[in-house]
Interface confidence: low
C-alpha cells in the first residue's frame, strides 16, 4: 500500500485546514492508528493528534479544541484531520505516520501554508495646491503573507514608488503616488489596488483628489460703455473667478465708499438708476484659503447731454 497526501496545503488565515493522509492499501489491510505531528526543521516533533481505530481521536493539549476528524461518513483508511482556524503560527511542516496491519508503518509529509490577506490602508498626502512641484498625493500600505502587490488605478498623470518591509511572518508593502498638482485634477479618483492570493478579488480604496487653486479675477458688465448712462436701470458688475475651495467675493470702491443704493450680492454688484455719483473705480476682491485676487474697473457714467464719449478702463491685478 501507499499513503496519499498533498505536498502543500494552502489556506487563508482563519479558515480550517484539511491535512490529508489516506492509506491506499491492498484488500484486507487495516489502519491501526495515525499519528500527526508538526516537524519543522531545527525543532523536535510536536504531537498534534493520535487517531486510533478503536479509541478514536486523542488531541495533544497544545492543540486542544483545534484538531478534529472530518465529518462523517469516514473511511477507516482515511487518517486526515482538520486543523481549525489556521493562524500564521501554524505555517510549517506536518507529518502523518500510519501504522497498518499487516503491512507495517508508512509516513508522509506536507507543508501548510497560511495566507494572510492584506488589509490595505490609504493615507492622503499633504494638502495639494496648484503651483507646487512634485508632491505626494497618497500612500497605500498593505501587509500580508506572502507580500501583497500594491498598484494604482487612475487617469491622473503621476509617478509611483514602492518599498517593502519584511516581518517574521509577513511583509508590508507601501506604494506612494506623486504628482504635480493642477486644477484639472480636482475630483479625480486615485485608487489603490491590492492583489494577493488570499483575496477572492482585488481590494480597492479610492481617494478623491482636491487641489487648491484660485483663478485670475475679471469683471464683466462694462463691455458696452454706452449703456452706462444717467438714468439707466438694472446696471450691474459681475466678478468672474473660480477656485477650490470655492472663493468668496467682496466689493469695494477705491476712490471712496460704495454709493448708497448699490447692492452687493456675492459676486455681483447691482446699481440703482445710474447717476454721475456712481462713476468711480470699483474693486472686486476674490479669496479662498489658498490665495486672493483683485480686479478693478473704472466706471464712467455718461451724461447724454454731453457729446464727448468717455472711455472705460479695465485693469486686472493679482
Amino acid at each position: 500500500g501507499e499513503l496519499e497526501t498533498s505536498d502543500v496545503v494552502t489556506v487563508v488565515l482563519g479558515q480550517d485546514a484539511k491535512l490529508p493522509c489516506f492509506y491506499r492499501g491492498d484488500s484486507g489491510e487495516q489502519v491501526g492508528q495515525v499519528a500527526w505531528a508538526r516537524v519543522d526543521a531545527g525543532e523536535g516533533a510536536q504531537e498534534l493528534a493520535l487517531l486510533h481505530s478503536k479509541y478514536g481521536l486523542h488531541v495533544s493539549p497544545a492543540y486542544e479544541g483545534r484538531v478534529e476528524q472530518p465529518p462523517p461518513p469516514r473511511n477507516p483508511l482515511d487518517g486526515s484531520v482538520l486543523l481549525r482556524n489556521a493562524v500564521q503560527a501554524d505555517e510549517g511542516e506536518y507529518e502523518c505516520r500510519v501504522s497498518t496491519f499487516p503491512a507495517g508503518s508508512f509516513q508522509a509529509r506536507l507543508r501548510l501554508r497560511v495566507l494572510v490577506p492584506p488589509l490595505p490602508s490609504l493615507n492622503p498626502g499633504p494638502a495639494l495646491e496648484e503651483g507646487q512641484g512634485l508632491t505626494l498625493a497618497a500612500s497605500c500600505t498593505a501587509e500580508g503573507s506572502p507580500a501583497p502587490s500594491v498598484t494604482w488605478d487612475t487617469e491622473v498623470k503621476g509617478t509611483t514608488s514602492s518599498r517593502s518591509f519584511k516581518h517574521s511572518r509577513s511583509a508590508a508593502v507601501t506604494s506612494e503616488f506623486h504628482l504635480v498638482p493642477s486644477r484639472s485634477m480636482n475630483g479625480q479618483p486615485l485608487t489603490c489596488v491590492v492583489s494577493h492570493p488570499g483575496l477572492l478579488q482585488d481590494q480597492r480604496i479610492t481617494h478623491i483628489l482636491h487641489v487648491s487653486f484660485l483663478a485670475e479675477a475679471s469683471v464683466r458688465g462694462l463691455e458696452d460703455q454706452n449703456l452706462w448712462h444717467i438714468g439707466r436701470e438694472g446696471a450691474m458688475l459681475k466678478c468672474l473667478s473660480e477656485g477650490q475651495p470655492p472663493p468668496s467675493y467682496n466689493w469695494t470702491r477705491l476712490d471712496g465708499p460704495l454709493p448708497s443704493g448699490v447692492r452687493v450680492d456675492g459676486d455681483t454688484l447691482g446699481f440703482p438708476p445710474l447717476t454721475t455719483e456712481h462713476s468711480g473705480i470699483y474693486v472686486c476682491h476674490v479669496s479662498n484659503e489658498f490665495s486672493s485676487r483683485d480686479s478693478q474697473v473704472t466706471v464712467d457714467v455718461l451724461d447724454p447731454q454731453e457729446d464727448s464719449g468717455k472711455q472705460v478702463d479695465l485693469v486686472s491685478a493679482s
Epitope: V12, L13, G14, Q15, D16, G65, R66, R84, N85, V87, Q88, A89, V116, P117, P118, L119, S121, N123, T141, E143, G144, R169, S170
Partner: nanobody, 124 residues
Framework: EVQLVESGGALVQAGGSLRLSCSVS????????MGWFRQAPGKEREFVAR????????DYADSVKGRFTISRDNAKNTVYLQMNSLEPEDTAVYYC?????????????????WGQGTQVTVSS
C-alpha cells in the same frame, strides 16, 4: 466606506458589568481578526482582547483575563466585549479594531481599521 461603530459605554459602579458592541460596515468582518483596545486619560493606548476570524480563538491582556469576554456574531458583522467585575482602573475610551494580524496586540492607529471609541467610566 469602512465604519466601526462602538456602543454600550456608560458610567458604572465598581464591581458592575457592561457589554460593549461594535458594528462593522463596509467590510466583511468574518474574514478579520477583531479586537478591543483602550486608552485611559494620560496613558498609552493598550490591547484588551482579540477574537480570530472563525471566533474560536480568543486572547486577552493579563489585566482583564477572567473578567472580560470577547465574542463575535459574524452573521451580524458585530463583535462584543462583556466586561464583568469592573474596576476603576478599567476607566478608559474603548476602541474597536479590525485587522488580520496575529500581532494585533501591537497594532497602532495607522494599521487596520479603528472605531471612534466609546467611554467607559467606573466609579468607586
Amino acid at each position: 466606506e469602512v465604519q466601526l461603530v462602538e456602543s454600550g459605554g456608560a458610567l458604572v459602579q465598581a464591581g458592575g458589568s457592561l457589554r460593549l458592541s461594535c458594528s462593522v460596515s463596509g467590510l466583511t468582518a468574518s474574514r478579520l481578526t477583531m479586537g478591543w483596545f483602550r486608552q485611559a486619560p494620560g496613558k498609552e493606548r493598550e490591547f484588551v482582547a482579540r477574537v480570530y476570524a472563525s471566533g474560536g480563538l480568543t486572547d486577552y491582556a493579563d489585566s482583564v483575563k477572567g473578567r472580560f469576554t470577547i465574542s463575535r456574531d459574524n452573521a451580524k458583522n458585530t463583535v462584543y466585549l462583556q466586561m464583568n467585575s469592573l474596576e476603576p482602573e478599567d476607566t478608559a475610551v474603548y476602541y474597536c479594531v479590525a485587522g488580520l494580524w496575529a500581532d494585533m496586540r501591537t497594532m497602532t492607529s495607522t494599521r487596520g481599521y479603528w472605531g471612534q471609541g466609546t467611554q467607559v467610566t467606573v466609579s468607586s
